[in-house]
């Protein structure tokens, strides 16, 4: 098989027929050196998953529930291309899971017990995970095994792919519980047919199923949707009456050597030639010999899943947790004031050492999780491996786009009521050596620049945003002759000035000596022409306040600020000579952890905050010898946000807009992944 062949996995005779047609039609439109299709037939989706993992096939389209199974070891598959619904202009990478009933049946969502149920398939999203996830904790005990509990709840079911021997009631309405289209009640259209034929009382499907199966409005009017407020609505009101929004079906491939670029190349060309309204002789999103063959008939096209996105990120924390809870039989305990330990995310070695010290001193209230970059930390918080960390505003933006929320803000000024009064922010400045007297904001081109890190507020978003408005392109590495902007591509001129050794060069963590505020200032002192930092950086590292050899003899008077009007001012005049006001760093977490992170951190700062006077013999949360480990060293307290409890409200409209403009220049793979899920 040539290397440019994608072996597509088909799960029925009808799918295999469509796959062969797909193969032949692609041959006719794609040059011989382009991607080609080969077809592999298996008995079920699970067999396809195993075949791909074993390198006997390369790709299959799966429901989100099965994407989770495909991701689990030993399969280790990942989503690579997603179907989208809606239109090309407004593509939706989700659909609605709904409960369809006949109009005259007269029961509500909270009266499903004893009814007959029709499911698309065991472990599938709209047909199983969502409805059973909603019903599960209301099921009578014992709830394990899950299939038995469901079988006892309904008076009869068709749940294709269930074990008919162990759980015959789940196959009562579709003898055999076959796991492919050989079973007339399999899949979306099958589950709807189960309801239509009168075998079942309720069908758990997707919002478009009824439209795809009943072209006539009068026929559709014989059906209704069950809503979560225990009412019913007409089938076209699914946006106001659904069980959940489910991530769209997606093509999966191996995580390693999975041909993901080739699969995308193939499908992208396929949608160009055979997508919606493209060709009469073969249509990718149509199934003349059945329904939803290879791809969903309701799909409008494909979108490439960002490479950073694994299955957990694609499905989202809520869905993964719902599936886990369902499979493990976990139901909520009665609410309690007890908080589980907060898992703090520490960046690289230095932060981990401080975090471990914190953990010991907290007596089990804080646990530590490590990651190499801020983005890796954010991803860990998203998927539940970690719970919280304190972030620069630029990363608060990314975290917010990824669904996290700010919970407390760092405050840098001493005040009587520090914890109750979040500050307006700090100043982003451009520092130069006084001796370079001809340097101004207007002639920075070709100079050597020092940045805290790519994506951070004072070091990147603010100065580069202003620069972008001036030069109208993103090639900042061409604007400056060289520089150190940790997090840049290693071969970029913006890594040339960095001092990290080997693999640590230009890394966005403390292993790179020029990382962060202090690092960027050190870069200016030793190699650069301009440093983009915060207004406190120069005084914090001069006049003997930083004892490190490179800093101990520095004098604040030897540095000046660049003002946007082309003038320069002394460092202490930052209030009249800055680039912009930056939002303070803030602690972020997931919504479900918000209350506990808030509570535990407030306890922790009362024990280890700035009220501790001797940090030589005691643990101090906000000290790390100017390294800004875990928190900025000039933090006085962590303050309540009051109503500024979303990333937009916290950062403010102006900053969100500025970072939004700079998104065109973003190299953040995480931001790309998160905006794929929530544009």
């Amino acid at each position: 098989v040539p290397d440019k062949t994608v072996r597509w996995c088909a799960v029925s005779e009808h799918e295999a027929t469509k796959c062969q047609s797909f193969r032949d039609h692609m041959k006719s439109v794609i040059p011989s050196d382009g991607p080609s299709v080969a077809c592999v037939k298996k008995a079920s989706y699970l067999d396809c998953i195993r075949a791909i993992a074993a390198n006997e096939a390369d790709a299959v389209t799966l429901d989100a529930g099965l994407v989770y199974d495909a991701y689990l070891a030993p399969n280790n598959l990942k989503p690579v291309v997603a179907e989208f619904y809606g239109s090309k202009e407004d593509p939706q990478t989700f659909y609605y899971a709904v409960a369809v009933v006949k109009k005259d049946s007269g029961f509500q969502m909270n009266q499903l017990r004893g009814k007959k149920s029709c499911h698309t398939g065991l472990g599938r999203s709209a047909g199983w995970n969502i409805p059973i996830g909603l019903l599960y904790c209301d099921l009578p005990e014992p709830r394990k095994p899950l299939e038995k509990a469901v079988a006892n709840f309904f008076s009869g079911s068709c749940a294709p792919c269930a074990d008919g021997t162990d759980f015959p009631q789940l196959c009562q309405l579709c003898p055999g519980c076959g796991c492919s289209t050989l079973n007339q009640y399999f899949g979306y259209s099958g589950a709807f047919k189960c309801l239509k034929d009168g075998a079942g009382d309720v069908a758990f499907v997707k919002h478009s199923t009824i439209f795809e199966n009943l072209a006539n409005k009068a026929d559709r009017d014989q059906y209704e949707l069950l809503c979560l407020d225990n009412t019913r609505k007409p089938v076209d009101e699914y946006k106001d009456c659904h069980l959940a929004q489910v991530p769209s079906h997606t093509v999966v491939a191996r995580s390693m050597g999975g041909k993901e670029d080739l699969i995308w190349e193939l499908l992208n060309q396929a949608q160009e030639h055979f997508g919606k309204d493209k060709s009469k002789e073969f249509q990718l999103f149509s199934s003349p010999h059945g329904k939803d063959l290879l791809f969903k008939d309701s799909a409008h096209g494909f979108l490439k899943v960002p490479p950073r996105m694994d299955a957990k990120m694609y499905l989202g924390y809520e869905y993964v947790t719902a599936i886990r809870n369902l499979r493990e039989g976990t139901c909520p305990e009665a609410p309690t004031d007890e908080c589980k330990p907060v898992k703090w995310c520490a960046l690289s070695h230095h932060e981990r050492l401080k975090c471990d010290e914190w953990s010991v001193n907290s007596v089990g209230k804080i646990e530590c999780v490590s990651a190499e970059t801020t983005e890796d930390c954010i991803a860990k918080i998203m998927n539940g491996e970690a719970d919280a960390m304190s972030l620069d505003g630029g990363f608060v933006y990314i975290a917010g786009k990824c669904g996290l929320v700010p919970v407390l803000a760092e405050n840098y000024n001493k005040s009587d009521n520090c914890e109750d009064t979040p500050e307006a922010g700090y100043f982003a400045i451009a520092v130069v050596k006084k001796s370079a007297s001809d340097l101004t904001w207007d002639n920075l081109k070709g100079k050597k620049s020092c940045h805290t890190a790519v994506g951070r507020t004072a070091g990147w978003n603010i100065p580069m945003g202003l620069l972008y408005n001036k030069i109208n392109h993103c090639r900042f590495d061409e604007f400056f002759s060289e520089g150190c902007a940790p997090g840049s591509k290693k071969d970029s001129s913006l890594c040339k000035l960095c001092m990290g050794s080997g693999l640590n060069l230009c890394e966005p963590n403390n292993k790179e000596g020029y990382y962060g505020y202090t690092g960027a200032f050190r870069c200016l002192v030793e190699k650069g022409d301009v440093a983009f930092v915060k207004h406190q950086t120069v005084p914090q590292n001069t006049g003997g306040k930083n004892p490190d050899p490179w800093a101990k003899n520095l004098n604040e008077k030897d540095y000046e600020l660049l003002c946007l009007d082309g003038t320069r001012k002394p460092v202490e005049e930052y209030a009249n000579c800055h680039l912009a006001r930056a939002p303070n760093h803030a602690v972020v977490t997931r919504k479900d952890k918000e209350a506990c992170v808030h509570k535990i951190l407030r306890q922790q700062q009362h024990l280890f905050g700035s009220n501790v006077t001797d940090c030589s013999g005691n643990f101090c949360l906000f000290r790390s010898e100017t390294k800004d480990l875990l928190f900025r060293d000039d933090t006085v307290c962590l303050a309540k946000l009051h109503d500024r409890n979303t990333y937009e409200k916290y950062l403010g409209e102006e900053y969100v807009k500025a970072v939004g403009n700079l998104r065109k220049c973003s190299t953040s793979s995480l931001l790309e992944a998160c905006t794929f899920r929530r544009p």
Epitope: N129, C137, L228, D229, E333, A334
Partner: nanobody
Framework: QVKLEESGGGLVQAGGSLRLSCAAS????????MAWYRQAPGKERELVAG???????NYADSVKGRFTISRDNAQNTMYLQMNSLRPEDTAVYFC??????????????????WGQGTQVTVSS
Amino acid sequence: QVKLEESGGGLVQAGGSLRLSCAASGNVFTIAAMAWYRQAPGKERELVAGITTGGSTNYADSVKGRFTISRDNAQNTMYLQMNSLRPEDTAVYFCNAVTKWAARVGGSAEYEYWGQGTQVTVSS
């Protein structure tokens, strides 16, 4: 969305009783558990008692044996029977509902919902 409305608060003498109600409306089928919280002036909000749809309960130590939480699933209402009230029970009492994980998939539901609160004042 879920809307929560508290009622039953008021002024009562120490040793007296009150019964708070919390009526839930909207997507009540998404609710996994409900709770009563309270906040006294100048203090943090604290949990008083919680209950799941299955009926398991939990109480703060300070109210154990005096307060009873209950739920009428058919009426979508939660209650807090407060006996032997003390001046330190004076606070605004809030109703809270936490949603089921499956209901939150794709951002379909919030993590939790809160009522506006009802004032309970216990005079000595």
